[in-house]
């Protein structure tokens, strides 16, 4: 907290300019009018204020706007944004995508901080949904943003926004999140032809049900093993050996390397050994000839 002292004669700031960087903290507090600062915030980021001086500027704005800064100030905060606490940011009403971009730019290249998370939350709540432009912006700065949202929050993503999603944006999503995103992606890409559709839908397939996987197996998609391993176990289990063979195409050989891992392991346990043998991969653990597994839940519990 800076002491309240009178501004020395001739030092009263008429405008926000570079001469102010040589003011002591108390001079800055005494000689810069908060209203002047607020109206000339666009100049602040171009002036190399010292670390301590930024604290003084924040203090002045806090006094002027105890209920929260107006957007005209927020969009020009620059490095001052990094002096804000989540509590400060909760008081803001940010509606402009340009303001959001300006503040995200300040934190660019760093992990999402509590301040940024609060800012995004305020912005998205203000908009009512995650529209395409917002999603474009957020995933450009934070590729993992989508996967940081709860399934409930993801439900507000309109299918049209899915076009903005890149495969790397889904890297850290769990099955519950993909369950929400997959139907939206299916809707978004429904008018694409087979091969183009598969390229787009591939990253979302961790949320696909069995019937969609069966349909894909009829389309010569040649799914890679990395994608197959991310499929829901409950969606893979009902697939026949022939369907998995068609689904994977030339990648079917990769099953051998993954036979001890889910969902491949669990899928093998559900197949007749005879059928598995037709693949010629040496997969073991299928149901022996003449056996009938009745209690499937017990079978899974034992495995």
């Amino acid at each position: 907290e800076v002491e309240k002292t009178a501004c020395p004669s001739g030092k009263k700031a008429r405008e926000i300019d570079e001469s102010l960087i040589f003011y002591k903290k108390w001079e800055l507090e005494a000689c810069v009018d908060a209203a002047l600062l607020a109206t000339q915030m666009d100049r602040v980021n171009a002036i190399p204020f010292t670390y301590e001086q930024l604290d003084v500027l924040k203090h002045k704005l806090d006094e002027l706007y105890p209920q929260g800064y107006p957007e005209s100030v927020i969009q020009h905060l620059g490095y001052l944004f990094l002096k804000m606490s989540p509590e400060d940011i909760r008081k803001w009403n940010v509606t402009s995508l340009e303001t959001l971009k300006a503040l995200l730019e300040v934190n660019k290249g760093h992990e999402m901080s509590p301040q940024v998370a609060t800012l995004i939350d305020r912005f998205v709540k203000g908009r009512g949904q995650l529209d395409k432009d917002t999603l474009d912006t957020l995933t450009a700065f934070y590729p993992g943003y989508l996967c940081s949202l709860s399934p409930e929050e993801l439900s507000s993503v309109p299918p049209s926004s899915i076009w903005a999603v890149r495969p790397q944006d889904l890297d850290t999503c769990d099955p519950r999140q993909l369950d929400v995103l997959y139907p939206k992606a299916r809707l978004a890409f429904q008018n694409m032809n087979g091969s183009e559709y598969f390229v787009k839908i591939q990253s979302f397939l961790g949320g696909a049900p069995t019937e969609d996987l069966k349909a894909l197996s009829q389309q010569n998609v040649s799914m890679d093993l990395a994608t197959f391993m991310k499929l829901r176990t409950d969606a893979v289990l009902p697939l026949t050996v022939a369907e998995v063979q068609k689904l994977l195409g030339p990648h079917v050989e990769g099953l051998k390397a993954e036979e001890r891992h889910r969902p491949v392991r669990d899928w093998i346990l559900r197949q007749r050994q005879d059928d598995l043998d037709t693949l010629g991969l040496g997969l073991q653990g299928g149901i022996p000839n003449g056996y009938l597994v009745l209690d499937l839940s017990m079978q899974e519990a034992l495995s």
Epitope: P48, Y51, L54
Partner: nanobody, 119 residues
Framework: QVQLVESGGGLVQAGGSLRLSCAAS????????MYWFRQAPGEERELVAT???????NVRDSVKGRFSVSRDSAKNIVYLQMNRLKPEDTAVYYC?????????????WGQGTQVTVSS
């Protein structure tokens, strides 16, 4: 994190010159502006000069025309060239910067280098 190491200080006669260096290491790509401060005995620390990534500089009025600041971006070194030194320039000179990290700003200082100007 950023490490700053100053050098080049010493004892010099009034009217003489010194060139201080500040070598930065660590997260130097995040640095925008470098600052030279000084602190005379019993006085408050004061800003002497600044230089930003683009090479724009600011120099305190009381040393303008005598002091200049420059940088060697390739070596991550900032210099403070001090000419026509006066006894009142006697102080410990510090290099400083701050960078964004983890959603906040972090302030970094060198250990300081003593400049003594005798009359």
């Amino acid at each position: 994190q950023v490490q700053l190491v100053e050098s080049g200080g010493g004892l010099v006669q009034a009217g003489g010159s010194l060139r201080l260096s500040c070598a930065a290491s660590g997260s130097t790509s995040s640095i925008n502006t470098m600052y030279w401060f000084r602190q005379a005995p019993g006085e408050e620390r004061e800003l002497v000069a600044t230089i930003n990534r683009g090479g724009s500089t600011n120099v305190r009025d009381s040393v303008k025309g005598r002091f200049s600041v420059s940088r060697d971006s390739a070596k991550n070194i900032v210099y403070l060239q001090m000419n026509r030194l006066k006894p009142e320039d006697t102080a410990v000179y510090y290099c400083n910067t701050y960078i964004p990290y983890g959603g906040t700003l972090h302030d970094f200082w060198g250990q300081g280098t003593q400049v003594t100007v005798s009359s």
